[in-house]
Interface confidence: medium
C-alpha cells in the first residue's frame, strides 16, 4: 500500500481543530511581482518580506517595493515601508542579514541614474528602525559582513574599487582600486585579487592576490599570476598560471598566504576548472574538470594539509564553471556525501560515500519500490537522487535533497529507482539512517521541510493547479495526515520555515488570482498543539550510527570512531523543543586499513582495501612540493584520513624528508613577498 495508508498508521487526535486554531493568514496589500523573505537572527521570530513590482515603461522601468516585518514567525506582518522612506529596493542584492544574532540588516536602494553613489538602509535592531546612508560609490555586490565582527563590511564598487566600513556602513573608505574579487578570511582578514593592465577579464591568470589584516592600513602581496582563489575550512587556495603554457595549478596555504605548497592535483587548461566542493578544518573535496566539454571530472580528497590528494571518484558530473553539480553534504550524518556520475552511456547515476570520500557506492534500492525502465535487470537496481542538475534541466523536481544536523540520520530527496536517474516524474524518498536505507515517502514530487529537529515533516504537493492542502508526518515520513489550511486554494510558490529546523512554524506562500487582481498571501501554521507535550527520556532510543553489522565489534566505526545517538522514537508524538541538543556518545575504534587513504603515488583497486603503487610511478622517487621546498616521501602507501580518530591497530609507516630544494612554482617565495602600508 502507499505510504501513509497502512492500517497501523495511527491518526493524530483532533489535529484539524488544533491546526485550525493555529493557522494564521496574511494577505499582502500588493500587486504580485516578486517576493523575497529573510529571517533575522536565530529564534527571534523576526521575518522580513520584500515585495517588488516592476512596471516596464517605454523608456525606463518603474519599480515599487514594500517591506513587511513579522516578529511572531510569520503569523502577523506589519507594513514598514515607511521606515525606508518608501524607497525601491534592489532585489538582486537581496537583504544582507548580519551573522549570528547581530540583528543587523542592510538593504540596497535603487537610485536615479545621475547620482554620485548608491544608497543603503541599515538596521541594527532586527529591522525595528532603519537609517538611510548615501554611499560614496555604486555597489556592484551585496555588502559582506566580516564573520568575526558584524560592524565590519566590505563591498566592491561598479568601478572595481574595494570599499570597507568599520562602523556598520556609516562611513566608507576605498582601500584599493582595480579589485576583481574580495573575501573575508578569519580574524577580519580580507583577501582580494587585483589587475594591473585593464580589467579582471583581460588579466585573468595575471592577477595578484593581496591580503590585508588591518582593514586596509597595510597590505601584503601573497601571490602572482593568479587565475582565481577560494577559501575552504582553514585552507586558502589559488589557481596559478604555469610559466610555460596556458595551464594552471592549485596552490594551497594554511597560514593565510604566508607560505604556499603546490597541491598534488592535475593541472588544468584554459577551458577546464577546479572547484572546491566541500571543505572543513580537516580536509577538502576538490573537483578537477576533465579536458574537453565532457561535463564531468574527478573528485580528489586531500590530506590534512590540503597538499597530497587521493582520487576519490571518477566521471563526476559537473557541467561547466559555475555550472551544475549534484554534490551534496548530508549534514544529518558525519562523513556522508551524495553526488552524481556520468556513466559511459551518458546516463546519470547517483553515488554515496559514508566515509568522507574513501569509497563510493550506489544507493540501496528502497524496499517498497520496483525498478523502472532504466533497469536492465528488473530485480536489481538502485535509488538515484535528483539534485541541482535535474533542477537545471527543468525536470519535475521542486527541491534539492534535504538534511539537517539536528535531525539525525534523516535525508529527504526526490528520486527514481533504476539503473540511472530518470526523467519520469519522481517520487520522494526518505532515509532515517543517513543514506544507508531508503523508503518511498510520498508519491510524486513535493516540497518538504523538517520541523522540530525531525519531530515533524511537512510536505506540499508540487502542482500547477492551486492548492489548499498540506501533509504532515510525526513519525519520520511513515504515516501522513492531510490538513486543508484554507477553503480558497492558492497558487503555491514556496514553503518557509526558520533555518535550523528547530521551529514548529511553517509558512505557506502563494498568491491568489481573481479576474482583476493578484495578491501575495501567506498561511503560517504552528504545530505546537499537535506535539502537545515535551519529550521525556522514555521518548528517545539509542541508535548506533553507520551500523551495518551489529555482530562486528567494529560496527559503526567511521573515520576511526563510532557514535551512539539518542533519537526520538518514531511512535513518540512530542516536542523536541527549540533548545533540543543532539545527544551523542563517541567511542574510539582500532585502526584498520579503512582508516587510511592511499598516499601520493598509490591507489586502491576496486573492492580492495590495500593501496598499491600507481604503475606509472613504480620505481620513481616520490617527491612533491611543500611550503616551497621539495620533499621526498617514504611511504608504504597509506596516510591517515583527515579527521580520523582511530588508535592502535594497524599503523603503516610514513616519513617525509626535506630535500632542501626550492620549488616555489609561480609564487613569489616568502622572503621576496612585498608589503606596503597606506
Amino acid at each position: 500500500s502507499a505510504p501513509g495508508e497502512d492500517e497501523e498508521c495511527g491518526r493524530v487526535r483532533d489535529f484539524v481543530a488544533k491546526l485550525a486554531n493555529n493557522t494564521h493568514q496574511h494577505v499582502f496589500d500588493d500587486l504580485r511581482g516578486s517576493v523575497s523573505l529573510s529571517w533575522v537572527g536565530d529564534s527571534t521570530g523576526v521575518i522580513l518580506v520584500l515585495t517588488t513590482f516592476h512596471v516596464p515603461l517605454v523608456i525606463m522601468t518603474f519599480g515599487q517595493s514594500k517591506l513587511y516585518r513579522s516578529e511572531d514567525y510569520g503569523k502577523n506582518f506589519k507594513d514598514i515601508t515607511d521606515l525606508i522612506n518608501n524607497t525601491f529596493i534592489r532585489t538582486e542584492f537581496g537583504m544582507a542579514i548580519g551573522p549570528e544574532n547581530s540583528g543587523k540588516v542592510v538593504l540596497t536602494a535603487e537610485v536615479s541614474g545621475g547620482s554620485r553613489g548608491g544608497r543603503i538602509f541599515r538596521s541594527s535592531d532586527f529591522a525595528k528602525n532603519f537609517v538611510q546612508t548615501d554611499l560614496p560609490f555604486h555597489p556592484l555586490t551585496q555588502m559582506m559582513y566580516s564573520p568575526q565582527n558584524s560592524d565590519y563590511l566590505l563591498a566592491l564598487s561598479t568601478e572595481n574599487g574595494l570599499w570597507v566600513s568599520k562602523n556598520f556602513g556609516g562611513k566608507w573608505e576605498e582601500i584599493h582600486k582595480a579589485v576583481c574579487l574580495a573575501k573575508w578570511g578569519s580574524d577580519n582578514t580580507i583577501f582580494f585579487t587585483t589587475y594591473a593592465n585593464g580589467s579582471c577579464k583581460a588579466d585573468l591568470g595575471a592577477l595578484e592576490l593581496w591580503r590585508t589584516s588591518d582593514l586596509g592600513k597595510s597590505f601584503k602581496t601573497i601571490g602572482v599570476k593568479i587565475y582565481s582563489f577560494g577559501l575552504g575550512g582553514r585552507f586558502l587556495f589559488a589557481s596559478v598560471m604555469a610559466d610555460k603554457d596556458t595551464t594552471r595549478r592549485i596552490h594551497v596555504s594554511t597560514d593565510q598566504g604566508d607560505t604556499w605548497s603546490m597541491a598534488q592535483l592535475p593541472s588544468v587548461g584554459q577551458e577546464q576548472f577546479y572547484s572546491i566542493l566541500a571543505a572543513n578544518d580537516d580536509m577538502v573535496f576538490m573537483h578537477v574538470d576533465e579536458p574537453g566539454d565532457t561535463g564531468f571530472g574527478t573528485i580528489f580528497t586531500s590530506d590534512d594539509r590540503g597538499i597530497v590528494y587521493s582520487k576519490s571518484l571518477d566521471r563526476h558530473l559537473y557541467t561547466t564553471t559555475g555550472g551544475e553539480t549534484d554534490f551534496t553534504n548530508v549534514t544529518s550524518l558525519r562523513g556522508v556525501y551524495i553526488t552524481s556520475v556520468l556513466s559511459e552511456d551518458n546516463s546519470i547515476q547517483t553515488m554515496i560515500t559514508f566515509d568522507q570520500g574513501g569509497r563510493w557506492t550506489h544507493l540501496r534500492k528502497p524496499e517498497n519500490s520496483e525498478c523502472d525502465a532504466t533497469a536492465k535487470n528488473k530485480n536489481e537496481c538502485s535509488l538515484h537522487i535528483h539534485a541541482s542538475y535535474s533542477i537545471s534541466q527543468k525536470l519535475n523536481v521542486p527541491m534539492a535533497p534535504l538534511s539537517e544536523p539536528n535531525a539525525v540520520g534523516i535525508v529527504i530527496a526526490h528520486g527514481s529507482v533504476g539503473d540511472a536517474i530518470s526523467v519520469m516524474v519522481p517520487d520522494v524518498y526518505i532515509s532515517d539512517d543517513g543514506g544507508y536505507s531508503w523508503t518511498k515517502m510520498l508519491e510524486g514530487p513535493h516540497y518538504y521541510t523538517i520541523l522540530d529537529s525531525g519531530g515533524i515533516i511537512v510536505a506540499i504537493e508540487h502542482s500547477s493547479r492551486p492548492i489548499n492542502v498540506i501533509k504532515f508526518s510525526t513519525d519520520e515520513g511513515q504515516c501522513w495526515q492531510t490538513y486543508t489550511f484554507t477553503r480558497d486554494p492558492i497558487y503555491f510558490t514556496g514553503l518557509a520555515s526558520e533555518p535550523g529546523a528547530r521551529s514548529m512554524n511553517i509558512s505557506i506562500w502563494g498568491f491568489t488570482e481573481s479576474f482583476l487582481t493578484s495578491q501575495w498571501v501567506s498561511y503560517t501554521i504552528d504545530f505546537k498543539d499537535i506535539l502537545e507535550r515535551n519529550c521525556e527520556e522514555k521518548d528517545y532510543t539509542i541508535w548506533l550510527a553507520h551500523s551495518t553489522d551489529p555482530e562486528d565489534y567494529e560496527d559503526g566505526c567511521i573515520l576511526g570512531y563510532k557514535e551512539q545517538f539518542l533519537r526520538l522514537r518514531k511512535s513518540s508524538v512530542c516536542q523536541n523543543g527549540r533548545d533540543y541538543v543532539v545527544t551523542k556518545q563517541p567511542s574510539i575504534c582500532l585502526c584498520s586499513l579503512e582508516d587510511f587513504l592511499c598516499d601520493f603515488g598509490y591507489y586502491r583497486p576496486e573492492n580492495d582495501s590495500k593501496c598499491v603503487e600507481q604503475p606509472e610511478l613504480k620505481g620513481h622517487d616520490l617527491e612533491f612540493c611543500l611550503y616551497g621546498r621539495e620533499e621526498h616521501l617514504t611511504t608504504n602507501g597509506y596516510r591517515k584520513i583527515p579527521g580520523d580518530k582511530c588508535q592502535g591497530g594497524v599503523n603503516p609507516v610514513r616519513e617525509v624528508k626535506d630535500l632542501k630544494k626550492k620549488c616555489t612554482s609561480n609564487f613569489l617565495s616568502p622572503e621576496k613577498q612585498n608589503s606596503k602600508s597606506n
Epitope: D293, T294, G295, F296, L317, T319, T320, L342, D345, N346, S347, I348, E370, D372, A373, T374, Y389, S390, Q393, L395, G418, D419, A420, I421, S422, V423, M424, V425, G444
Partner: antibody, heavy 129, light 107 residues
Framework: QVQLVQSGAEVKKPGASVKVSCKAS????????MSWVRQAPGQGLEWMGI????????SYAQKFQGRVTMTRDTSTSTVYMELSSLRSEDTAVYYC??????????????????????WGQGTTVTVSS | EIVMTQSPATLSVSPGERATLSCRAS??????LAWYQQKPGQAPRLLIY???TRATGIPARFSGSGSGTEFTLTISSLQSEDFAVYYC?????????FGGGTKVEIK
Amino acid sequence: QVQLVQSGAEVKKPGASVKVSCKASGYTFTKYYMSWVRQAPGQGLEWMGIINPIGGSTSYAQKFQGRVTMTRDTSTSTVYMELSSLRSEDTAVYYCARDPFGIALAGPASRYYYGMDVWGQGTTVTVSS
Amino acid sequence: EIVMTQSPATLSVSPGERATLSCRASQSVSSNLAWYQQKPGQAPRLLIYGASTRATGIPARFSGSGSGTEFTLTISSLQSEDFAVYYCQQARLGPWTFGGGTKVEIK
C-alpha cells in the same frame, strides 16, 4: 508479463469521432509515457503524440493538433486516444506503444532514448460512408 | 520536424548473407534513434535503442551503429524469420518521426 491490450476494431462515418483504449498491465503504469502510432494500409508508421500518465500532460504531432485528444485513467491503467472529424484517410491501424522517452536523465551531451519497447496489438479503424 | 530517410526502399538478400540498412536524419539526432522490425499483420517490435543497444531478447546478429545524422542497421547473417520491414525512428526533437521503411525480401 508486460502487455498493452487495445479495444476492438471500429467502423466510423466521415465527420464522426473514434475513441480507442489501451489497457496496460504487468508494470507500474505511471512510470512510462505512452505514444500513439498509426499505420495506413500499405504505408509506413506515423507518430501521433505522447501522454505522460502522471498529470496527463500531452504532446501531439502538428498534423493531428486540434483533432486528437489523449487521456488516461490511472485507476484502470488505461490510456485513450480520441480522433475527431474523421475522414477516409484516417483509415488505419492505431497502435499504443509504451515509450520510456528519455527515461534515463542523460548528461550534458545528449538525452538517451530507449525506444518504444512494448506495443499494443493494434486497433483497426475504418472510415467509410 | 526532423525528416528520416531510409535506403534502400527494398533490399533483396539471400538467407545467410549480410544485410546493411541505412537511415539518414535531416539534422543531428545524437544517439536518440531506435530501429523496429515489422512483419505483416503484426505490431512493430523494438530491435535497437540508443542507436546501438540491442533490446531485450534480440539476437546478436542485429547491430546498430552511427550517431548524429547517419545510422546503420546490420543483420550479419539473415535468417528466414528476419525477412520483414525495418523502420528507424528518432526521438531527439518532437514530433517523433519514422523513416519510410526498408523491406528486406528473399532473393
